[in-house]
Interface confidence: low
């Protein structure tokens, strides 16, 4: 069921009222402020590292900067999962981890971050500018995905290598609509506050009714409407396509991290230089009830859920082998 922030109907202030800020108009700034504060967009950061000593070995680390509880993490390469990318690992906080070669080890690092080691040798390893994507399904934020790759540079001294301009897809009209309303609201709130700053302090008029303070609530589409959703994502263009992964040669670059997207304050401390593209990962509010874990992304008509996990009663522990078979 879709639930939205319940904002009381606001009538224009009566002419002649000093300050034009009756109790009803006072509600608006607080509602907008609540929306602005609670609508802080979660972010996903992705880091990709190639070991200098082991050029065919990649480490991908992903984290979720949000307050919700993570219900599933999907790591893919060659593009976002559901848009041509191939799944490398799926991590479920309770049912365990399933990974496919060339994933060597997927594991939870913290409650909101994971790491994945990819292994290959020579012609079988992924090429250096392969795109790796991480998608976090969380409640109530929904599904958020970001991608990163090793920038195509082999200069060991480069501390902040240039990253290609990300492509931002925003197919989800609902999210855009809500975002637009929130953005407009925040701007309007600032405008109101600025106007209010230059006016005498208003007198609060006693009201006969004291309506409950509105609560901003996240909305989640029902299962029935999921199929119509599209997951927006931020991704980096790469010249290495999934189809060529089997023959691509590894990039002989240094040991370093490429990060996207993140903020300096939230960056986990990596061992080397950082590259950052401060583009927040976009997401969709996707219901994850009853294992509808696959994103509602662009897919051929014959695709759907079906990400499979290894059920492990012991919880989130990495298991051996591409299918998590001990």
């Amino acid at each position: 069921m879709r639930t939205e922030a319940q904002v009381p109907a606001l009538q224009p202030p009566e002419p002649g009222l000093e300050g034009a800020m009756g109790h009803r108009t006072l509600v608006l700034p607080w509602v907008l402020l609540t929306l602005c504060v609670t609508a802080g967009t979660p972010e996903v950061w992705v880091q990709v590292r190639m070991e200098a000593t082991e050029l065919s070995s990649f480490t991908i680390r992903c984290g979720f900067l949000g307050s919700g509880s993570i219900s599933l993490v999907t790591v893919s390469w060659g593009g976002p999962n559901g848009a041509g990318g191939t799944t490398l690992a799926v991590l479920h906080p309770e049912r365990g981890i399933r990974q496919w070669a060339p994933a060597r080890q997927a594991r939870w690092e913290t409650q909101s971050s994971i790491s994945l080691i990819l292994e290959g040798s020579g012609a079988s390893s992924p090429c250096a500018n392969t795109t790796f994507c991480c998608k976090f399904a969380s409640f109530p934020e929904g599904s958020w995905e970001a991608c990163g790759s090793l920038p195509p540079s082999s200069d060991p001294g480069l501390s902040a290598p240039p990253t290609p301009a990300p492509i931002l897809r925003a197919d989800l009209a609902g999210i855009l609509g809500v975002s637009g309303v929130l953005l407009f609201g925040c701007v309007y709130l600032l405008h109101l506050l600025r106007r209010h700053k230059h006016r005498p302090a208003p007198r609060l008029q006693p009201s006969r009714t004291s309506p409950q303070a509105p609560r901003a609530r996240a909305w989640a589409p029902s299962q029935a409407s999921q199929a119509a959703l599209h997951v927006p994502y931020a991704t980096i263009n790469t010249s290495c396509r999934p189809a060529t992964l089997d023959t691509a040669h590894p990039h002989g670059g240094p040991s370093w991290w490429a990060s996207l997207p993140t903020h300096a304050a939230h960056r986990p401390q990596g061992p080397a230089a950082w590259a950052s593209t401060p583009i927040p990962a976009r997401g969709s509010f996707v219901s994850v009830e009853n294992g509808l874990y696959a994103q509602a992304g662009e897919r051929p008509p014959h695709t759907g859920p079906g990400l499979t996990l290894f059920p492990d009663p012991r919880g989130p522990r990495a298991m051996e082998g591409p299918l998590g078979v001990r």
Partner: antibody
């Protein structure tokens, strides 16, 4: 066009071993798991295990761990299953099947070989 | 291991009728389920995956439904080529297991 072609029928003695093959074509062999399934006469299907040609990674049903060994030859895009210490109960049709990867949706078997009949008889 | 219980074991119906085959998993498999059709002497053929998604080339008279532990395959207006054995299979982690099968016979 994706095709999965299996080797012909085998008649073997109890205690012996047999190696059957599954040749794939029409797709990138290294990118999809290849699974093996047993079907005894008039019975249901039993999953034996899989191999990932990319790096030879395998996973087995515990019931077949001591019975089957899965290997691949990437140069010929062929998967193999060796069955050892054969008994009469191992007489069955053995099928190989490619695991699909529909944009991240994996697990289902979308292309199957025609099956290899293994008969164990003294 | 997750066990798959398929019912009925056999079914005798006429062309044009509608049938429903059910599959119950011993644990939640989160829609990680496929349905296959197998004709005598042939290998299985994928019909449905992800519990509800029709595989390429499968006629629309087939439909899959269900979630959690209960799943079903419905065949509307049965055609002569639909007769044979039907199997469900879970792929929620290994070992993958199949249902016992449903034999669909012409009445």
């Amino acid at each position: 066009e994706v095709q999965v072609q299996q080797s012909g029928p085998e008649l073997v003695k109890p205690g012996a071993s047999v190696k059957i093959s599954c040749k794939a074509s029409g797709y990138t062999f290294t990118k999809s798991n290849m699974h093996w399934v047993k079907q005894s006469h008039g019975k249901s299907l039993e999953w034996i295990g899989y191999i990932y040609p990319y790096n030879g990674g395998t996973g087995y049903n515990q019931n077949f761990k001591s019975k089957a060994t899965l290997t691949v030859d990437i140069s010929s895009s062929t998967a193999y299953m060796e069955l050892r210490s054969l008994t009469l109960e191992d007489s069955a049709v053995y099928l190989c099947a490619r695991e699909a990867d529909y944009y991240g949706n994996r697990g289902q078997f979308d292309y199957w070989g025609q099956g290899t009949l293994v008969t164990v008889s003294a | 291991d997750i066990q798959m219980t398929q019912s009925p074991a056999s079914l005798s119906v006429s062309v044009g009728e509608t049938v429903t085959i059910t599959c119950r998993a011993s644990d939640n498999i989160f829609s990680n389920l496929a349905w296959y059709h197998q004709k005598q002497g042939k290998s299985p053929h994928l019909l449905v995956y992800g519990a509800t998604n029709l595989a390429d080339g499968v006629p629309s008279r087939f439909s899959g439904s269900g979630s959690g532990t209960q799943y079903s395959l419905k065949i509307n207006s049965l055609q002569s080529e639909d007769f044979g054995d039907y199997y469900c299979q879970h792929f929620w982690g290994t070992p993958y297991t199949f249902g016992g099968g449903t034999k669909l016979e012409i009445k």
